[in-house]
Amino acid sequence: GPGPCDGNPCANGGSCSETPRSFECTCPRGFYGLRCEVSGVTCADGPCFNGGLCVGGADPDSAYICHCPPGFQGSNCEKRVDRCSLQPCRNGGLCLDLGHALRCRCRAGFAGPRCEHDLDDCAGRACANGGTCVEGGGAHRCSCALGFGGRDCRERADPCAARPCAHGGRCYAHFSGLVCACAPGYMGARCEFPVHPDGASALPAAPPGLRPGDPQR
């Protein structure tokens, strides 16, 4: 007859081994439960962004649920209703919807509430929170320390926006640093390794044309 491991009852990349009575799942890092069905991310990890309220899930498949404040949605309250469609920021500035107001994050070499002022060099330029002023091509910008952004590095930035987790891993920002919750089948601090080392010899191909030093799309 069929064995208890047929069809692999272990979720999220867990490996199944038969026991005298039934089966046992060995779960990859970040998952647990009889069938590795429970994510290791809980309310203690602070997964709800933008002031969302975290409550424990009612069933084992949902370790937490985020109740989002007005203006935010998504499973982690990470999505905001877009009020930037009118493109109020000039000179390629990035529009930020703060809920109570819109703000422009200006490209290097521009400043002002709507990025309307053209700047030229680092002279007399102060970058806050440990940022350093970088000149180049007639423009300049602040290279900000982790967790800060904006023209002068005065704004709190979301370090997860840079997509630091590989292979579809989900990023969470903590006071002690970033954490990646890996997609099934991957492990490592940044989800860079397949769980099963005896599997495929190559990783999924990188998208063509993207290089680490290139501007991110």
Epitope: L146, P164, A166, A189, E192, P197, G213
Partner: antibody, heavy 124, light 113 residues
Framework: QEQLVESGGGLVQPGGSLKLSCKVS????????VSWVRQAPGKGLEWIGY????????YYASWVNGRFTISSHNAQNTLYLQLNSLTAADTATYFC?????????????????WGPGTLVTVSS | DVVMTQTPASVEAAVGGTVTINCQAS??????LSWYQQKPGQPPKLLIY???TLASGVPSRFKGSGSGTQFTLTISDLECADAATYYC???????????????FGGGTEVVVK
């Protein structure tokens, strides 16, 4: 312009200690880490360890065995390599290197920007 | 720890020729293999990462291939400026310490006649 500049190298006696600094600018630690690599005169490259400041993690080659320590001062965009219990075998040029870890969700793990290096000479 | 074995230690070829450098890993390193070029008195320069992707500004005469444990760097249409030492570098999962680590090959000196 992405840049790394090492400093702090010099002559040190066997058994002594030294702290190397690496000033970095022009990139975001969310996607990049910083590695230390050394090269003895006329020899090949040897990886020492790397720091992933965004994740608060530091990794070392097994041969380091606690003698070397990598740390960072994020507010000043400065990385450090503390060298202890030095011997003549540690004489080398020490490079501070940017490592492209995961950029826009894609894992690279390549060392794409190198500092000029700083020479450490261990001799009595 | 993973050991990266690079062959040959030295190779000589004429201008316009082709050189092939091999790099063998002692365990599966997937696609995490980079190649570097180093000239005397200079730091290394990244040529190729993720086995086959050219770094910015590197000419297409440089080609990387392979997967798993066997990797190759091929330099075609050799120029005098290609005379240098070439290193491979892996990133791998260290099961003993449960984290990622890097390792370099011993290097290959390319002499262009």
């Amino acid at each position: 312009q992405e840049q790394l500049v090492e400093s702090g190298g010099g002559l040190v006696q066997p058994g002594g200690s030294l702290k190397l600094s690496c000033k970095v600018s022009g990139f975001d630690f969310s996607n990049y880490g910083v590695s230390w690599v050394r090269q003895a005169p006329g020899k090949g490259l040897e990886w020492i360890g790397y720091i992933d400041p965004a994740f608060g993690r530091t990794y070392y080659a097994s041969w380091v065995n606690g003698r070397f320590t990598i740390s960072s001062h994020n507010a000043q965009n400065t990385l450090y390599l503390q060298l202890n219990s030095l011997t003549a075998a540690d004489t080398a040029t020490y490079f501070c290197v940017r490592v492209a870890l995961v950029v826009a969700g894609v894992a690279y793990y390549g060392m794409d920007v190198w500092g000029p290096g700083t020479l450490v000479t261990v001799s009595s | 720890d993973v050991v990266m074995t690079q062959t040959p230690a030295s190779v000589e070829a004429a201008v316009g020729g082709t050189v092939t450098i091999n790099c063998q890993a002692s365990q599966n390193i997937y696609s995490y293999l980079s190649w570097y070029q180093q000239k005397p008195g200079q730091p290394p320069k990244l040529l190729i990462y993720r086995t086959s992707t050219l770094a910015s500004g590197v000419p297409s005469r440089f080609k990387g291939s392979g997967s798993g444990t066997q990797f190759t760097l091929t330099i075609s249409d050799l120029e005098c400026a290609d005379a240098a030492t070439y290193y491979c570098q892996s990133y791998y999962y260290s099961s003993g310490s449960s984290y990622g680590a890097f390792a370099f090959g011993g290097g290959t000196e390319v002499v262009v006649k």
